[in-house]
């Protein structure tokens, strides 16, 4: 009997990231008696839900239950039955749902209502589904990576990492500026974490995720096309795709480029030219107006960049596919590789990457070029500061992203003071 293992005193939590292009379910685990320590929570499972993002279910809300089934059943298997009832489940929807809400609160509510009803059917402690703000998305991403990197731990207050997050519909930049006043109150966050104060800058650029940026670029470029053929430098030579004008103008992101066109469809014909693609993308960033000492683009305040940055989500996935995540690869080298990649004929690309879905494969030239344009011209990284960008997918087995930070906050696992001190009221938490 002496050798019998004691039941481990652990807790679990589930967060669903309802993004614009897909939903992912994350399961986290931590030792119950250490929940106020930094770095003890870790991810034990990621389940990617098959299908698009929840905002695409507007016309088929009855399918949402089935859509979520596989991953919720997976959670049932992974988490011991005895823990089900005390395992919290949170769903956070991001920019795809912000865009749907912008078009219609009713439709966004309807989708979330059905999601809530579906998730309530499971034996877990469902805590609700909501659309998180862009500011929350940025802040929780920053908390996640610094928690996992142990940057809140050290008494000397080693520098925190900045967070760069790229999704399908938005992108976030979050960091602690160096002795710089955050000139725009909308971009300022104050945290007290583990006994230390942090003045954090964050901004979420809605419509500047990689998918919505592509829709914007297409809507901009078709304005000046002489006919229903769009010769596009952001797609490989020989690539062809028909686009419905109605699909192009479905999103609020293309509203400023909307016009009456003499055709219902147009054909993208790839010409694969990185430089021209880059130039076209730059036209999406309005840098002519800045009411502050310094801006990113579109009149949004951005303090001087400071310290190291973790670039995750699509920043990582795209650069990983392009084999450009190594810290040894300079910005000049990345640009050089992108030039070569975009110039490769479509037939050749399809052969080289036979296992990759054509829809995704066709967009890597645009996405890679967009990432470079966003980081360099949008956020003002330079060839020198490029080495401070670390493309990261996971940190010690946990995905970099907003979900862990969100759960840590909602479960009150990030204390304002060092855990040694007396427990404080909930009001002191983030």
């Amino acid at each position: 009997t002496q050798n019998k293992a004691l039941p481990e005193n652990v807790k679990y939590g589930i967060v669903l990231d309802a993004g614009s292009s897909h939903t992912s379910l994350y399961i986290y685990k931590w030792p119950a008696e250490k929940e106020n320590d930094t770095g003890v929570v870790h991810q034990v499972e990621e389940c990617r839900v098959k299908g698009p993002g929840i905002s695409k279910f507007v016309q088929k809300v009855n399918e949402i239950g089935i859509y979520l089934t596989d991953c919720m059943e997976r959670a049932r298997e992974v988490i011991p039955r005895s823990q089900h009832q005390e395992t919290p489940v949170y769903l956070g929807a991001t920019a795809g749902m912000r865009l749907l809400r912008m078009e219609s609160e009713e439709l966004a509510d309807r989708v979330l209502d059905v999601v809530e009803r579906s998730l309530s059917n499971y034996p877990f402690d469902f805590q609700g589904a909501r659309i998180i703000t862009g500011q929350e998305e940025g802040a929780y991403g920053w908390i996640t990576i610094n928690y996992l990197l142990g940057r809140f731990k050290t008494p000397g207050g080693s520098e925190t990492f900045g967070a760069l997050d790229l999704g399908g519909a938005s992108t976030q930049v979050t960091f602690v500026p160096q002795n710089q006043t955050i000139e725009s109150p909308d971009n300022a966050l104050q945290f007290r974490l583990y006994g230390k104060d942090y003045n954090v800058y964050t901004h979420s650029f809605l419509c500047y995720g990689k998918d919505q940026a592509l829709w914007q670029k297409l809507a901009k470029d078709i304005q000046v096309a002489s006919n229903e053929i769009l010769r596009d430098p952001c797609f490989h030579p020989g690539y062809k795709k028909v686009v419905n004008v109605s699909d192009l103008y479905k999103t609020p992101c293309t509203k400023r480029f909307e016009m009456t066109l003499p055709f219902q469809q147009f054909e993208i014909q790839g010409i694969g030219n990185y430089q021209q693609c880059h130039q076209s993308i730059l036209e999406l960033f309005n840098t002519s107006y800045c009411p502050y000492s310094q801006c990113a683009f579109n009149g949004i305040f951005l303090p001087p960049l400071q310290g190291d940055f973790g670039a995750f989500s699509a920043f990582y996935f795209v650069m990983k596919f392009l084999n450009l995540t190594s810290e040894k690869v300079s910005q000049e080298k990345v640009t050089e590789m992108m030039k070569k990649f975009c110039a490769q004929p479509w037939e050749e690309i399809k052969t080289s990457y036979a296992g990759v879905k054509e829809k995704y494969l066709s967009e890597y030239c645009f996405s890679g070029t967009y990432i470079l344009s966003l980081l360099l011209q949008g956020y003002h990284f330079t060839a020198d500061s490029w080495e401070h960008i670390h493309f990261i997918g996971k940190i010690q087995g946990s995905d970099a992203g907003w979900t862990l930070g969100y759960m840590l906050n909602l479960t009150n696992m990030i204390p304002a003071e060092q855990p040694l001190s007396t427990p404080l009221s909930h009001s002191t938490y983030v």
């Epitope: 507007v58 016309q59 809300v61 912000r98 809400r101 912008m102 078009e103 219609s104 609160e105 009713e106 439709l107 966004a108 509510d109 309807r110 703000t133 862009g134 500011q135 909308d186 809605l206 419509c207 609020p252 992101c253 293309t254 509203k255 400023r256 480029f257 909307e258």
Partner: antibody
């Protein structure tokens, strides 16, 4: 708490233009559209159009197209409506309202009087 | 354009009784399983105040005595029991398609 604060009353001459403002607070300004509504004689409500603060794109009621211009300044979280070539028919209260399809929050209104 | 015909144009109801206002659309205002029909209350010198959204959902802080119903083209707003504070103008609105339109209004008074 969400608030929409509109500019004060305007007395303008026929043929002139008027530009009114609507300052938003209590929410992310670029996450919601801003609509403009005209109310004449305390009874008839007419939707003028809306602007997407995110990018400045706008959609109008055909009746007001070409005569109304909608703009925003995102740094000051303010939406503007300019109406040109005013006639006595334009004497009315003008409201801004936040929403996609649900006008849950309204400004207090700007009263415009067109008189020689 | 979708035309909304509101009736009656004016209505006097005794305190504690039921007030019913009707709104008929020239075509269906339903889409994707949602009725894009809204009801507003407006008091003199004030902006309209959202009472009901999506035909039957109560707006934030709206008392339970305000009830909306209907779908497709026929909608109604019921107020029961009528209170003195309910004296106001009431408007229906559709946002199914541009241009968004309002009904002509109903003036509700105490009998």
């Amino acid at each position: 708490e969400v608030q929409l604060q509109q500019s004060g009353p305007e007395l303008v001459k026929p043929g002139a233009s008027v530009k009114m403002s609507c300052k938003a607070s209590g929410y992310t300004f670029t996450d919601y559209n801003m609509h403009w509504v005209k109310q004449s004689h305390g009874r008839t409500l007419e939707w003028i159009g809306y602007i997407v603060p995110l990018n400045g794109g706008s959609t109008f009621n055909q009746k007001f197209k070409g005569r109304a211009t909608l703009t925003v300044n995102t740094s000051s979280r303010t939406a503007y409506m300019e109406l040109r070539s005013l006639t006595s028919e334009d004497s009315a209260a003008y409201y801004c309202a936040r929403g996609g399809t649900r006008f849950a929050y309204w400004g207090q209104g700007t009263l415009v009087t067109v008189s020689a | 354009d979708i035309v909304l015909t509101q009736s009656p144009a004016s209505l006097a109801v005794s305190l504690g009784q039921r007030a019913t206002i009707s709104c008929r659309a020239s075509e269906s205002v339903d889409n994707f399983g949602v009725s894009f029909m809204y009801w507003f209350q407006q008091k003199p010198g004030q902006p309209p105040n959202l009472l009901i959204y999506g035909a039957s959902n109560q707006g934030s802080g709206v008392p339970a005595r305000f009830r909306g119903s209907g779908s497709g083209t026929d909608f109604s707003l019921n107020i029961h029991p009528m209170e003195a504070d309910d004296t106001a103008m009431y408007f229906c609105q559709q946002t199914k398609e541009v241009p968004y339109t309002f009904g002509g209004g109903t003036k509700l008074e105490i009998k």
